[in-house]
Interface confidence: low
């Protein structure tokens, strides 16, 4: 049509302008299309040098609205990571700060001799919320192995116990020394904290995940149908006429196929920790016992003190009479130690409110993956609001016929506007998938009261999740995996635990 | 003109490291991609390294992901390799190359160089 | 993913030559490609095509450069003594999101 030809081009010359781009690249009027390698090739306002400018830039454009939605995930999750980190943190801090202030008074040299077992204790506790891979069961045992030990000694400076040691140590289990603080406390902890650090975890996890899929770049395939959706239409001369929503559904469908992949495995993650959270609340939740810590070390120390005698006259019956210390003073003690009354502090429904918070957000962000497509084209991409006959196919302006391709890679096979080999998954996103699978076992593991070890993640996932966990009293002591002096390093770690924090040699 | 010199080649020995530096003039340089492409001896050219114009995108080939680090500062104007735990395959001329442009993530490098360097010889033995 | 090139071409001073470089197996990606000519072992290349069909502005006209689908072709247009040398393409290797040579073409005249 000899008119076209004369068409001017100053609307395409203003909007290319406007991107930053040198007007001289623009013709004065449509010049014949033969040289474009992505736009139809009739008549039009779009050089060569203008074609690629306009494919590099709506390639940067989405891959800025790409990281802006990651971004604004990734905050979302670190906000609810911080508040309850943060939380469970204070929560084991002010259990040390009053066992700091109320020991002294009440236990006299009892606690003021150890107060290195204590403060060695909550620095155990600490790195294992923290996500270092010890085992906690063997830490509580060394722990009341230590103190028993040390406080027997401050008991009876008359006698010379080292002979007793070993015997000591044999007979602590049968003759439970600190009465049912030990077990309680073992029983309690392991699933609480399991549960707390698992939780916190798994937000990581997630956060972790956004920010490394957000890394993958975009296929050369997806830049050319991008450059398509967004400026052929300038090109072709019909710069008014915006993207069909099926259309541009097509196109980044195709460009996220990969990307949507991950949808099931994030819902699972997600299901999973909203789940979790109902290890949080009651006598043995997580806010209960993480800030009750010093509750069980009081009825712990004050039942030896109640027991001493029975327990001094069980160690002689089992172990022998033992020899005198005659530079040793008798067994009267040398301060008053008294009996501590502490009550668990009622809650502050400070962590129902955090964990409420979470859970709708978490909900909120279920279908992240899959519904970017459809987000991207109402936020992003100036879609048109309906399908009819003025808006922008990819060659005219004109209604579009092509069906939506579904979710996910597969259903790419025949996806009319990016061709997408659906034999070659992306290797980073298929590196995250298993990621999610793996963090998702640990909060069902987790949530049956396991031990997770917080190994490094690139195991192979596998394994089953526990049912509904068990009462505390049913619950037996299980047989540790790994000795406690062979902690391996942590990839996967809490935030500001360091490697070397997470390991600690014998 | 476009002029890129690189430097920092020469016998180096197996296991250790190699830190080549490149610096170019003749054309406002942050506003284009750069990479290194090396040639064994007696064969033929081999994709290294590349870097988009503002630093944030990298790719490097197969034969030294995982060894190597490129970086570039933009307001020296140079552009530096470091290739650990070199081996005997890594001996050859290591060239600078300027890009035409770095087309989104540098993806294209390959086929957009249009300016290269002297080269620097780097022999492992 | 390899990038196809002939061995070696050869042609009379004058002729028109045609060097193709192709991408092998499922390869679909790039639809760029460069082509950079070393006229001796251990010179520096020299650009004569770059972006498929740019041409540095001290390279001669009779050097072209288009593409087909996954290949691309350098016409030499009146070949000349001086041209003889090897020319590598260069381009995009998807699977290894990195950048990708060819083997060579050694041009004698």
């Known amino acids: 049509d000899p008119a076209s030809k004369s068409r001017s081009c100053s609307e395409v010359r203003q909007i290319y302008g406007a991107k930053g781009f040198s007007l001289s690249d623009v013709p004065q009027a449509e010049i014949s299309g033969e040289h474009l390698r992505i736009c139809p090739q009739g008549y039009t306002c779009c050089t060569s040098e203008m074609e690629e400018n306009l494919a590099n830039h709506s390639r940067m454009e989405l891959e800025s609205a790409l990281h802006d939605s990651s971004r604004a995930l990734q905050a979302t999750l670190a906000t609810q990571l911080h508040g309850i980190d943060d939380h469970f943190q204070r929560l084991l801090n002010d259990s040390e700060r009053t066992l700091q202030e109320a020991f002294p008074g009440a236990f006299g040299d009892l606690y003021t001799q150890n107060t290195r077992a204590f403060r060695d204790l909550y620095a155990e506790l600490r790195l294992y919320y923290r996500g270092a891979n010890l085992h906690l069961e063997e830490t509580l045992a060394e722990f009341w192995a230590r103190l028993l030990e040390r406080l027997f000694k401050q008991l009876h400076p008359q006698l010379l116990p080292d002979d007793y040691l070993d015997c000591l140590g044999k007979q602590a289990e049968a003759l439970r020394p600190f009465g049912d603080a030990p077990r309680e406390l073992r029983l309690r902890a392991t699933r609480a904290f399991v549960a707390a650090r698992s939780f916190v975890q798994g937000l990581g996890v997630a956060s972790d995940v956004v920010r490394k899929v957000a890394q993958v770049p975009l296929a050369p395939e997806c830049s050319r149908a991008i450059m398509k959706l967004v400026y052929c239409a300038h090109c072709r001369g019909v710069p008014g006429a915006r993207p069909c929503p099926d259309y541009c559904r097509n196109v980044l469908k195709g460009c996220l196929a990969n990307q949507a992949d991950l949808d099931a495995e994030w819902r699972n993650l997600l299901d999973s920790m909203v789940l979790i959270t109902d290890k949080f609340w009651g006598p043995s939740g997580a806010e209960s016992v993480i800030g009750g810590v010093h509750v069980w070390l009081a009825e712990a120390i004050n039942a030896l003190q109640d027991n001493k005698d029975t327990l001094t006259a069980k160690v002689i019956q089992a172990c022998g009479n033992p020899k005198v210390n005659p530079h040793g003073s008798g067994p009267e003690e040398k301060r008053r130690r008294g009996k501590l009354a502490l009550q668990e502090k009622p809650s502050t429904g400070t962590l129902e409110k955090l964990v409420s918070e979470a859970k709708a957000q978490l909900r909120d962000i279920q279908d992240f993956w899959i519904s970017l497509p459809g987000t991207l084209c109402s936020e992003k991409m100036a879609m048109s609001p309906a399908s009819d006959d003025r808006c922008w196919n990819g060659i005219s302006k004109g209604r579009y016929l092509p069906e939506v391709m579904g979710d996910g890679l597969a259903n790419q096979i025949n996806n009319p506007e990016v061709e997408v080999d659906i034999t070659k998954p992306d290797m980073t996103i298929r590196q995250q998938i298993m990621q999610l699978k793996i963090m998702t076992n640990r909060l069902r593991g987790a949530y049956g009261g396991n031990d997770v070890d917080f190994q490094d993640a690139s195991d192979d996932g596998s394994g089953s999740g526990s049912g509904g966990g068990c009462p505390d009293d049913t619950c037996g002591r299980r047989v540790s995996k790994k000795s406690s002096s062979s902690r391996t390093p942590l990839t996967h770690a809490l935030p500001g635990l360091s490697e070397q924090e997470g390991q600690k040699t014998s | 003109a476009v002029t890129l010199d690189e430097s920092g080649g020469g016998l180096q020995t197996p296991g250790g490291a190699l830190s080549l530096v490149c610096k170019a003039s003749?054309?406002?340089?942050?506003?284009?991609?750069m990479g290194w492409v090396r040639q064994a001896p007696g064969k033929g050219l081999e994709f290294v390294a590349s870097?988009?114009?503002?630093?944030?995108?990298?790719a490097y080939g197969s034969a030294v992901k995982g060894r190597a680090t490129i970086s570039r500062d933009n307001r020296q104007s140079t552009l530096r390799l470091q290739l650990n735990n070199l081996r005997a395959e890594d001996t050859g001329t290591y060239y600078c190359?300027?890009?035409?442009?770095?087309?989104?993530?540098?993806?294209?490098?390959?086929?957009?160089?249009?300016?290269w360097g002297h080269g620097t010889e780097v022999t492992v033995s | 993913v390899a990038l196809t090139q002939p061995a070696s071409v050869s042609a009379n001073p004058g002729e028109t030559v045609k060097i193709t470089c192709s991408g092998s197996g499922s390869y679909t990606g790039s639809y760029y490609y460069g082509w950079y000519q070393q006229k001796s072992p251990g010179s520096a290349p020299v650009t004569v095509i770059y972006n498929n069909n740019k041409r540095p502005s001290d390279i001669p006209s009779r050097f072209s450069g288009s593409t087909s689908g996954s290949t691309a072709t350098l016409t030499i247009t009146g070949v000349q003594a001086e041209d003889e040398a090897v020319y590598f393409c260069?381009?995009?290797?998807?699977?290894?999101?990195?950048?990708?040579f060819g083997a060579g073409t050694t041009l004698t005249v």
């Open positions: 870097i988009s114009s503002d630093g944030s995108d990298t």
């Open positions: 260069g381009s995009y290797d998807r699977s290894s999101d990195s950048g990708i």
């Open positions: 190359a300027k890009s035409y442009r770095c087309s989104w993530n540098c993806w294209d490098y390959a086929a957009k160089i249009d300016a």
């Open positions: 003749g054309f406002t340089y942050s506003s284009y991609a």
